[in-house]
């Protein structure tokens, strides 16, 4: 993942420095929030694994990298990071694993430099459509976000609202066309069954898309045509059975693309012929020699690249009424 990584080897904490006897009061007040560690030189604040229930109000204005991981934030309200003066330099915000279940409209407003946001490993039962756009206007002000990391944000089944989780996430990605500048989108490990057909067309700047470890069965209705800048497409560990001609042609037409397809239950029957032919010719699939059949049983573990048309047959399927004798 491309979440903001640790950028300073050591950090000054908000605890006062102790002299041998009594601690001398520093001449200028410490600007590091309680329960956080700060490095002014790295412009980094870390409030990690401290069971914080809200975002500290006294974040220093110099912060560029903010880690709020491993806390118990529960809800991120509107303007959660709005400050006076604003956190004008905050560029990377990592909120992963902080037990967030609700992110409200405008939660990330007033962060004009925010380029990288990681909300991974939070059970987001309620992600507002306007979490990233900040307003319900049909066209919002462009978000500065370039990387959005949303791996494993699916809540447990009993906590889900009565609506499609895929739909909720996509609504937030598309609201107000605010994320037109997004270059990296990670949506791994979210139990996605499908990808709404319009989502990719409205994220034209994408370079990296990670949909690995989901439950995608088909890409039939997904169009990659507009993603001319796409460099990597991660589809490992899904439930894909076959890629059809339309998808193959679109992927082949992307000038910079690398596609990752490992660990999918490929069905090696007559419908797989086009994909096998394409795999043998294409350079876009990374590790294509590792792709193997899962079904039918007689084909299990056969390497796709080693198949020929004679291997790919479809047994005639009788209508149910004719299957009993």
């Amino acid at each position: 993942s491309s979440s903001p990584t640790s950028s300073a080897s050591s950090f000054s904490s908000s605890a006062p420095f102790l002299a041998s006897a009594v601690s001398a009061q520093p001449p200028l007040p410490d600007q590091c929030p309680a329960l956080c560690e700060c490095s002014e030189a790295a412009r980094t604040v870390k409030c990690v694994n401290r069971n914080l229930t809200e975002v500290p109000t006294d974040l220093p204005a110099y912060v560029r990298n903010l880690f709020l991981t491993g806390n118990q934030l529960a809800v991120l309200p509107a303007g959660a990071f709005a400050r006076r003066p604003p956190l004008a330099e905050l560029a990377a915000l990592n909120l992963s694993g902080s037990r967030l279940d609700e992110v409200r409209a405008g939660a990330f407003e007033h962060l004009p430099s925010l380029r990288q946001l990681d909300l991974s490993h939070n059970p987001l039962a309620d992600l507002s459509p306007f979490a990233f756009s900040g307003s319900n206007a049909s066209v919002s002000a462009p978000s500065p976000l370039v990387e959005l990391i949303l791996n494993h944000i699916v809540p447990p089944e009993d906590e889900r609202q009565n609506r499609s989780f895929e739909g909720m996430v996509v609504a937030a990605l598309l609201a107000g066309r605010a994320l037109q500048g997004l270059r990296r989108l990670e949506l791994a490990s979210n139990h996605f069954l499908y990808l709404p057909r319009d989502v990719l067309a409205q994220l034209p700047s994408l370079r990296h898309l990670d949909l690995s470890n989901n439950s995608l069965v088909s890409l039939t209705y997904v169009s990659f045509r507009n993603l001319t800048h796409l460099e990597s497409l991660h589809l490992e560990d899904n439930a894909l059975k076959v890629l059809h001609n339309g998808t193959l042609a679109e992927l082949q037409g992307l000038p910079h693309i690398r596609v990752f397809l490992d660990n999918n239950p490929w069905v090696c029957d007559c419908h797989m012929a086009d994909m096998v032919t394409w795999l043998k010719e294409t350079e876009v699939v990374q590790g294509k020699d590792r792709l193997t059949c899962a079904y039918p049983e007689k084909m299990r573990n056969r390497v796709l690249l080693e198949l020929n048309s004679a291997d790919l047959d479809c047994d005639p399927i009788l209508p149910p009424s004719l299957q009993t004798s």
Partner: antibody
Framework: EVQLRQSGPVLVKPGASLKMSCKAS????????MTWVTQSHGQSLDWIGL????????TYNQKFKGKATLSVDKSSNTAYMDLNSLTSEDSAVYYC????????????WGRGTSVTVSS | ENVLTQSPAIMSASPGEKVTMTCSAS?????MHWYQQKSSTSPKVWIY???KLASGVPGRFSGSGSGNSYSLTISSMEAEDVATYYC?????????FGGGTKLEIK
């Protein structure tokens, strides 16, 4: 307790170079910008430059570009300043100080290194 | 460069007397800091962000001002206040100090 311990006084000949040190204790130098200031005898203070020990990036007062070079050794928690092509005009006390980014000010200062340039 | 001009350069005050010194900036700044330096010692931050007293600074000191004009005031002069006071701006490069106001006691 935060302390900045500077190297002792030096007498050098014109044209020579020298490297003075500023050892920090009570905090990690990599976490704070460090700055250097000079004061000629009985005169005002003059800002020389600033170093970000985390990135190594430096910013100099144009007046001291080519004269002073700032560096840091994070492993020993020490900041350094090199002065080259010394003349009698460079005779002064040189202070290191910790810069506070949120305040745009220095909070802790060393005691200064006295430099005398004389033949 | 933002030139800071302090006045007066030297002043003396009797114990208990009110003292005011000023610092004029050639370009507007949002904050001014003040440092106190006693003879043969390094400077100490005295007032920061125009009006906030650094830790340990007596309450008789105050700072004010905005834009191009700032001042430091001592409400009641005491012997331990004898020092040189420098204004300083750390917003625009190069950072600059004023020429100092040397405060003596009568």
């Amino acid at each position: 307790e935060v302390q900045l311990r500077q190297s002792g006084p030096v007498l050098v000949k014109p044209g020579a170079s020298l490297k003075m040190s500023c050892k920090a204790s009570g905090f990690t130098i990599a976490d704070y910008y460090m700055t250097w200031v000079t004061q000629s005898h009985g005169q005002s203070l003059d800002w020389i430059g600033l170093i970000n020990p985390y990135s190594g990036e430096t910013t100099y007062n144009q007046k001291f570009k080519g004269k002073a070079t700032l560096s840091v050794d994070k492993s020993s928690n020490t900041a350094y300043m090199d002065l080259n092509s010394l003349t009698s005009e460079d005779s002064a006390v040189y202070y290191c100080a910790r810069w506070r980014l949120g305040y745009y000010a220095m909070d802790y200062w060393g005691r200064g290194t006295s430099v005398t340039v004389s033949s | 460069e933002n030139v800071l001009t302090q006045s007066p350069a030297i002043m003396s005050a009797s114990p208990g007397e009110k003292v005011t010194m000023t610092c004029s900036a050639s370009s507007s700044v949002s904050y001014m800091h003040w440092y106190q330096q006693k003879s043969s010692t390094s400077p100490k931050v005295w007032i920061y962000d125009t009006s906030k007293l650094a830790s340990g600074v007596p309450g008789r000191f105050s700072g004010s001002g905005s834009g191009n004009s700032y001042s430091l005031t001592i409400s009641s002069m005491e012997a331990e206040d004898v020092a040189t006071y420098y204004c300083f701006q750390g917003i625009g490069y190069p950072y600059t100090f004023g020429g100092g106001t040397k405060l003596e006691i009568k």
